[in-house]
């Protein structure tokens, strides 16, 4: 494939990222889903300075992230490790509440109405953000 | 590598107390709920008592409930068992376990409550 | 409470056998089930998690499937280090409950 070099219609760009702001909501597997068959991944933040971007751009809504921990430990779609990177939790969280009655624990991470960070349950209808990276290949085949 | 290391079993008489510690490693502890989990001798897997990544929630079994205090320090990357009053049939090995789904282990400590 | 139940109770094989445990909740749980092998004198290990969540450094012949109320853990060949003790645990809600296991020896 070819590499992308701007993003592509309906999408921001930002510090060689392309990012894609959603105005329904869905739950986080079915968000994950549309951002991958997008090319893409729910969006990653590994800075404050993304942290802010995003924040600006979903205003105080709750939107899903690519943050979850279905599997045990906290990981980012993406394979950024959680351990050593950015986090920006509210406080008291992540809090796996088990009070909610719907089953489980709460596995998945989206931005609060602050812009921190909350784990819920991941059948919740949130909306959601998909980020892709400029310098990556695309699936696409090249124009030639 | 996430590490969990239990510690503070021993021999105690019925009615006694001991507090139990599990010092964790390798991992963000915050992020993470941790639990205490048994296995009397000879006998299966007993879930203990569960307490949330920042302390604010707290569960208990039946069969421990107003005689054992689970806690944290996150600070200090560790979570604790305190247990008082206790019986002939709280004799067993204390795991403790990180999340819900119990995903990494500690070795054990045996505690031994007999007369 | 969950009550699990767990079949068979023992179960004797040879290396190389494909074998099957079953893990039946009492109520629905959805996927919130694990899988744990035990080894005499030592800690538990997670196998699997959310029912078919191969855990990180789990060899890929351990399988887990079911949803609901009904779960099996499959080990497609036995191998000398896999003969255990097998337990399902339920954390779809408080207070988490394990199965009694099933234990694999050799026949």
């Known amino acids: 494939g070819s590499e992308r070099t701007c993003c592509p219609v309906n999408w921001v760009e930002h510090e060689r990222s392309c990012y894609w702001f959603s105005r329904s909501g869905k739950a986080w597997a079915d968000a994950d889903n549309y951002c991958r068959l997008e090319d893409a991944h729910l969006v990653v933040v590994t800075s404050w300075e993304e942290q802010k971007f995003v924040q600006h751009h979903i205003g105080p809504v709750n939107t899903w992230m690519g943050l979850h921990d279905q599997n045990g430990p906290w990981k980012w779609v993406d394979g950024t490790d959680y351990e050593t990177g950015f986090k920006n939790w509210r406080p008291e969280q992540p809090d796996d509440w088990y009070g909610h009655g719907l089953g489980g624990g709460e596995d998945c991470a989206h931005f609060t109405d602050d812009g921190r960070w909350n784990d819920d349950v991941c059948q919740r209808p949130y909306r959601w953000v998909c980020e892709t990276e400029l310098d990556k290949a695309s699936q696409e085949p090249p124009l030639l | 590598e996430v590490q969990l290391v239990e510690s503070g079993g021993g021999l105690v008489k019925p009615g006694g107390s001991l507090r139990l510690s599990c010092a964790a490693s390798?991992?963000?502890?915050?992020?993470?709920?941790m639990n205490w989990v048994r296995q009397a001798p000879g006998k299966g897997l007993e879930w203990v008592s569960s307490?949330?990544?920042?302390?604010?929630?707290?569960y208990y079994a039946d069969s421990v409930k107003g005689r054992f205090t689970i806690s944290r320090d996150n600070a200090k990357k560790s979570v604790y068992l305190q247990m008082n009053s206790l019986r002939a049939e709280d004799t067993a090995v204390y795991y403790c376990?990180?999340?819900?789904?119990?995903?990494?282990w500690g070795q054990g400590t045996l505690v031994t409550v007999s007369s | 409470d969950i009550q699990m139940t767990q079949s068979p109770s023992s179960l004797s094989a040879s290396v190389g056998d494909r074998v099957t445990i079953t893990c039946r909740a009492s109520?629905?749980?959805?996927?919130?089930l694990a899988w744990f092998q035990q080894k005499p004198g030592k800690a538990p290990k997670s196998l699997i998690y959310?029912?078919?969540g191969l855990q990180s450094g789990v060899p890929s012949k351990f399988s887990g499937s079911g949803s609901g109320t009904d779960f099996t853990l499959t080990i497609s060949s036995l191998q000398p280090e896999d003969f255990a003790t097998y337990y399902c645990?339920?954390?779809?809600?408080?207070?988490?409950?394990f199965g009694p296991g099933t234990k694999v020896d050799f026949k």
């Open positions: 376990a990180r999340v819900s789904g119990f995903d990494y």
């Open positions: 390798g991992f963000t502890f915050s992020s993470y709920s």
């Open positions: 307490i949330s990544g920042t302390g604010s929630f707290i």
């Open positions: 109520q629905a749980i959805s996927n919130y």
């Open positions: 959310g029912a078919s």
């Open positions: 645990q339920q954390y779809n809600s408080y207070p988490f409950t």
